[in-house]
Structure formats: C-alpha cells, structure tokens
C-alpha cells in the first residue's frame, strides 16, 4: 500500500478506490462493481451490443473500441458535417453517397449505373448480363451458344460484343430480298461455277457442291504430281502426250524424231492450243508417212507394230485434244494425203456425216458422249493413206464361220496369201472412248482402187493384238455392198478401218458381191 492509501495491485483498466479496493475504468466492467482481490479483471464493455443504450442513428454503424465506441457512417454514406466519427444519434449527419455521380465509369462500358441507398447497381445494356462472380460487372451474352440462337439453318451465328449476326455460310448468298446479317437472314447455295466466282485452274472443270465447289481434271487430264484431284487448288496436266511414246524395241531415227515433235508439242500445251496442236501432230504424221526413212528397213512385223502404235496413239491424242475445241466442223488436209474431219457439238439428237476425199462416215450423235461426261461431243475421222506402206502384207485373221463360208463359195486363197489394201486406212473416234459395242452401227463408204474381177472384197478393221502389233479382222464389220471403186461397210465398233481385197478366186456369182447403190 502506498502512503496515500491506494491499492497497488489494481488489475489492468482499473483505478484504486482506496488501499483495499479498485474500480474498473469507464468502458470496462468486472464481476462486481468494487474489486477487492487482484484475481479479478476489467473487461471492455461492447457499447455496440444489441442491448446497449447507445444509438448511432440511421445510415450509421457502431464500432466498439477499447474502453469506448465510435459511430461511423455506413458504406455508401458520408457525414454532411465532415466529422468522421460521432457518439450518438443527435450528432449523426450521415447521408447517401451518389457513387454513380462520383465515378461515371463504375459500371465499365456495357452497363448503366443506378444509385441506391448506400450503394449502386449496374443495369446491363441489351446483349449483356451481370457476371455471377462480380454482380457489378456486365459481360457479353453469347447468343450463339446460349441456346437462344435465332438464326436460320442456312446461316451461321456470329457472336458480336453485345449482339450477334446471322451470316450466310461460305459459299452461300442471301436469297433475293433477304439481308445478310440480321436474324431474318435466309441464304441459298452459290453456284460458283456458273457465276464465275471459282478459282479453278484452266486445266480443270468446276463442279458445284453445296456451299462450295471443287475442281476436277478435264477429261484426258490427270492431277499434277503430288496434287490431289477434286480440290479447289487442283492443277492437272494433259495425259494425251505423256503416254504416246515410241514403241519399245523399235529402233528408228525417223520415228524418234516424230515422237520428239509430239513431246515438244505436249510440253507447253494449253487447252487453247488444241487446234494448232492437232494440226501440228497430223502435219508431223503426214511427213513421217510420206518419208518413212529407216522405218521401211524394219522387218514387216515391226512395221505392223509401229503402225498399230501410231493408230492407237493418234486416236487417243485426237480424242483428248478435240475435247478442248470449240463447237463446229473442222477439216484439215496435208500434202501426203492425210486428212482429218472433226465435228464438235454440245450433244444433239441427230446423225452425223463426215465426208472426206476417199471416205464418208455416218453415225448417230448419241454414240459420241459418255453419260456424265461434261465435255462436248466429238466425232472424228482421219484418213491416213500413208499408213498403207507400214501395213503392207499385214495378216488377215477371219472368224471361223467367215473362213468356212469363204471356202464354200471360193476355191481358196491363191498362192500369195496376203490380202491387198484397196483403200486408205481410216481411223474413227468419238469423245466417248467406250466404242467396242455401239448401240447403232456406223457406216463407212470407201472410195478405192479398182477391184480385180472375181476377187473377194472385205471390210476390215485393225485389231491391236496383245503383243502390241495386230492384224486385220472382220469381227463386227460387214460388207454391205461393193462396186468397182467403192465399198460400203457397216461396223458395230470403232477403230481403224480399211477395205481389203483377198486373194480368193470366185467360182460363181457371189450374191454378197451384188452391187448395192
């Protein structure tokens, strides 16, 4: 005890009353009002507790402090007096803060700020919604994925910030009268091929597909190495020339020079050059057959092989090239007698007649085109008199029935067994290469050298053998009639044709040889 009679053991937050008693300081309380033992404590009174007599008034909060309390304005309110704290309701000057006015960018770009008592809310613009994790932040509504996609099925939905568009899909366009963008947009497929909006290379044909297009190699063309067919970027090359090369095992400088020319013409070939290229190939062939050079020194069988190879290749090349010609009739003739007649048409329903110096061909246009082939219909006839040199002594192989019939009406083959070629060799071709079994026959009228009396005249075609050579044959071809210098033939397939005179001695009048005019 000190000299003044005050207890020295008073607990924290208390003051002595006398030498034996203490009392808690204002704002603190103990179990009993007077503290008589040091074991007792003074605890802070929470003036802000519910049963407390303290009232701060509206728009304010009570904050308990050690031994006291403060009244402060609630968040979103501020004191008009400027005093940050106060003690009772009478000192309260709290009023609502207009946060929207204080900070115009409070709701960022896509909301409107609305002041409320003590706070604010963000009202989102159309096309936006409040973010669940941040109710004050407006975020874009993706109409395209939210299940409220209002676009027509012919369009695709494009989400924009705060909006959406219904756009035509690539390769589609708005139907007449329809907009392109609003939710009432309706689209239809664009035919890029007919509208010229395609990027197909000139070596391809454009095919329209739903919403797009593809580029396919032209007939007789193949995709360039490593480039797939039927793509937008397909580029093709002409197969016409690549396959027509000298026959294996034949050594002839004259023939090599001819094929060098063919390959040269193919190297920088373009569809627009078809006419010139056809003429140049036939010019080169005409020159080759006019001056065969070392070809004439080859064994007969090899000459027949060369002829077979030339006829076969020429047909393929002319078919391929003529598909790039424009509609109309073409006639070319060359110094040594080679002649080409060609008619190109979009398919028409009539018969076609091609006339040449020494041959006339008549057939039905419907034969010309393979179904589904988009290209023009082509009918062609080439007369190649010079081929006769290479086909001298070529064998004739008759069907067993014809062989028997000939033996019944004729005494048999005379000593020199090879038939004589009376006419020019002609080659007929169509844009359709499937000509082994024509639905209606083709008729040829040949002008030729005079027939020796009592000799058998036969309409023949060149059959390309398995060995790459070939022989004359009559299968599918019949002699309709013959007179001294002309013969009419009818065949059910196309190939290279001629009229032969077989060395048979006719014993009596043969009804087959009756002249039909």
């Amino acid at each position: 005890q000190d000299s003044r009679g005050c207890a020295r053991w008073c607990p924290q937050d208390s003051s002595c009353v006398n030498a034996t008693a203490c009392r808690c300081n204002p704002g603190f309380s103990s179990f009993s009002e007077i503290i008589t033992t040091p074991m007792e404590t003074c605890d802070d009174i929470n003036e802000c507790a519910t049963l407390s007599k303290v009232s701060c008034g509206k728009f304010s909060d009570c904050w308990n402090t050690e031994g006291s309390y403060d009244c402060v304005c609630s968040p979103g309110y501020e004191p008009v007096s400027g005093a940050k704290t106060f003690k009772n309701e009478s000192e309260n000057t709290c009023q609502d803060v207009d946060e929207c006015q204080q900070n115009p960018r409070l709701c960022k770009s896509y909301g409107t700020c609305v002041n409320t008592l003590g706070s604010y809310t963000c009202q989102c613009l159309p096309g936006f919604k409040l973010k669940p994790e941040d109710p004050k932040l407006c975020t874009d509504v993706n109409e395209c994925t939210s299940g409220q996609n209002p676009c027509h099925s012919s369009t695709h939905c494009l989400n924009n910030v705060g909006s959406y568009q219904c756009r035509c899909r690539p390769g589609w366009q708005p139907i007449p009268g329809s907009p392109n963008g609003p939710n009432n947009t309706v689209c239809e497929d664009v035919d890029e091929c007919s509208s010229g909006q395609h990027q197909c290379d000139s070596s391809t044909v454009c095919f329209n597909t739903v919403g797009s297009y593809s580029c396919r190699c032209r007939p007789g063309w193949k995709p360039r190495h490593g480039i797939p067919n039927n793509q937008k970027d397909t580029v093709c090359e002409d197969m016409t020339f690549s396959t027509w090369t000298p026959p294996p095992g034949v050594h002839s400088q004259t023939l090599s020079r001819f094929f060098d020319k063919v390959q040269d013409l193919g190297r920088d070939y373009k569809p627009g050059l078809a006419n010139n290229t056809i003429q140049s190939i036939l010019q080169a062939l005409d020159e080759l057959l006019e001056a065969p050079g070392d070809l004439e020194t080859l064994p007969r069988l090899q000459q027949h092989c060369v002829a077979s190879h030339l006829l076969d290749g020429l047909e393929d090349v002319l078919r391929g090239l003529s598909k790039n010609l424009s509609n109309g009739l073409l006639n070319f003739s060359y110094p040594a007698g080679t002649e080409l007649s060609l008619e190109v048409q979009k398919q028409v329903d009539r018969s076609v007649t091609l006339r040449q110096n020494q041959a006339v061909m008549q057939l039905d246009w419907n034969q010309a085109q393979k179904s589904g082939d988009p290209g023009p219909s082509v009918v062609g006839l080439v007369s190649i008199p010079g081929m006769g040199k290479l086909l001298a002594e070529a064998p004739l192989v008759l069907e067993p029935e014809k062989q028997m019939l000939l033996h019944e009406t004729h005494q048999g083959l005379l000593q020199d067994g090879s038939p004589i070629l009376l006419s020019d060799v002609i080659s007929a071709f169509l844009s359709n290469n499937d000509t082994q079994n024509l639905s209606s026959p083709v008729t040829f009228t040949f002008s030729h050298r005079s027939v020796i009396p009592r000799q058998k005249v036969l309409c023949v075609f060149w059959e390309h053998g398995q060995n790459g050579c070939g022989h004359w044959a009559t299968t599918g071809c019949s002699t309709i009639g013959t007179r001294d210098t002309s013969t009419i033939c009818r065949c059910t397939h196309l190939s290279s044709f001629a009229v032969l005179m077989a060395h048979y001695d006719v014993q009596e009048e043969d009804p087959v040889l009756t002249v039909i005019t």
Epitope: D201, S202, S203, R257, D260, K261, Q263, D264, L265, R267, D268, K270, P271, G272, L273, N275, N276, T277, S280, Q283, A284
Partner: antibody
Framework: QVQLQQSGAELARPGASVKLSCKAS????????MQWIKQRPGQGLEWIGA????????MMTQKFKGKATLTADKSSSTAYMQVSSLASEDSAVYYC???????????WGQGTSVTVSS | QIVLTQSPAVMSASPGEKVTMTCSAS?????MHWYQQKSGTSPKRWIY???KLASGVPNRFSGSGSGTSYSFTIRSMEAEDAATYYC?????????FGAGTKLELK
C-alpha cells in the same frame, strides 16, 4: 489481220522500273503464248520468257527471273512486261511476239526501246 | 539449256550465188525455226518447222536438217536477202536463239 502493237520508247533512271505493253488484235489472244525478246544494240536476240494469257501461266529464262514480270490482261488483249531495278545493261529494244512450238514466232511487235540513263 | 551455234558469223555473197548457213544444236531439236532481221526493224519468221516457208517468203529459200544439225539455204542470192538470220528452238525450256549469221551483199 494479226497485229501486235507495243508501247512507246522509255527513258528511265537506274534503279527505276518500266512496264511495257503489247496489245494484240486479229486473233484469239488467250490461245497463244506471248513471247518477250530482248535485243541490245548491235547484238542478237535473247529470249526473256513467255506468258499464256489463257491462264496467266509464265515461263522464264533463269537470267530474267526477279528482273522481269510477265502478265496478261484478257479483257484488253494486252500482255505486259515489267522490268525492275533498271541498270545500263537493260538498255535494249524489247519485242513481243506470238509463239507456238511448231510454228515459231509468227508475228512480232514493232519493239519498244528502253534507255537507262542517269 | 540447248545452245545453238550459227556459222559463219558473217558471210558475203554475190547476186545469183548459192548461200548456205548452218545451225548446230548442243542437244537434239525437233522444231527449228529461222528468222530474218534487217537493221532497225523487227525480226520476221522466215522458215518454220525446219523446212516450211513462212507466208510471203520467196521459194529460193529452203531449210533442212534434223537432230542437232540444221541448215538454211538461198538458191540464188538477191540484194534484198542481205540481212541477219537467226535460228531458234523451243524443244526444251528455255527457248534459245543462235547468235545470228550476218549475210552481206558482195
């Protein structure tokens, strides 16, 4: 009749570019290669390259790749050659000519003289 | 590339004289063409496809050859034939010309 009309003479500074034109008439422009040939004074003929107007395809001699650009405008039947980064050795007469493998160059323009001088 | 070598580089001939010039190719060529050029004018196609005369070319001119060896002949020289003659091939890219043969009137 077939005619190839070339643009007029050009005088250009080193480093500049010139674009020469060759207007075709009297035939189907898209059906033939258009050749471009250079001839320096007192020298022979030198092939630059060719453009096929039908599809814009070009071929060029190695020496002129990067130097000359060949194009064709189907709508006006005109072939163009742009020569860039001009130097004194580009001073020459430039001819356009219609060409086909088997026929050679059957029709020629009158030539355009290009002079490069500082 | 195929190199075309023309010989002679320069030659002269009197009127009525036969003239022959040659064009030798470094590789085989299948289409050979010849052009005539007079000073200050554009070249003119003179012979194409080895031996075919271009339109308007007198028949005293002829061409022949094959493979790597080609020739150009004037049966009887005339004053108007004095010019430079070039051979040209397009059998392989790049297209090439010979350096030319200058034919002068003696």
């Amino acid at each position: 009749q077939v005619q190839l009309q070339q643009s007029g003479a050009e005088l250009a500074r080193p480093g500049a570019s010139v674009k020469l034109s060759c207007k075709a008439s009297g035939y189907t422009f898209t059906n033939y290669w258009m050749q471009w040939i250079k001839q320096r004074p007192g020298q022979g003929l030198e092939w630059i390259g060719a453009v096929y107007p039908g599809d814009g395809d070009t071929m060029m001699t190695q020496k002129f790749k990067g130097k000359a650009t060949l194009t064709a405008d189907k709508s006006s039947s005109t072939a163009y050659m742009q020569v860039s980064s001009l130097a004194s050795e580009d001073s020459a007469v430039y001819y356009c000519a219609r060409g086909f493998t088997a026929y050679g160059m059957d029709y020629w323009g009158q030539g355009t003289s290009v002079t490069v001088s500082s | 590339q195929i190199v075309l070598t023309q010989s002679p580089a320069v030659m002269s001939a009197s009127p009525g004289e036969k003239v022959t010039m040659t064009c030798s190719a470094s590789s085989s060529v299948s289409y050979m063409h010849w052009y005539q050029q007079k000073s200050g004018t554009s070249p003119k196609r003179w012979i194409y496809d080895t031996s075919k005369l271009a339109s308007g070319v007198p028949n005293r001119f002829s061409g022949s050859g094959s493979g790597t060896s080609y020739s150009f002949t004037i049966r009887s020289m005339e004053a108007e034939d004095a010019a430079t003659y070039y051979c040209q091939q397009w059998s392989s890219n790049p297209l090439t010309f010979g350096a030319g043969t200058k034919l002068e009137l003696k």
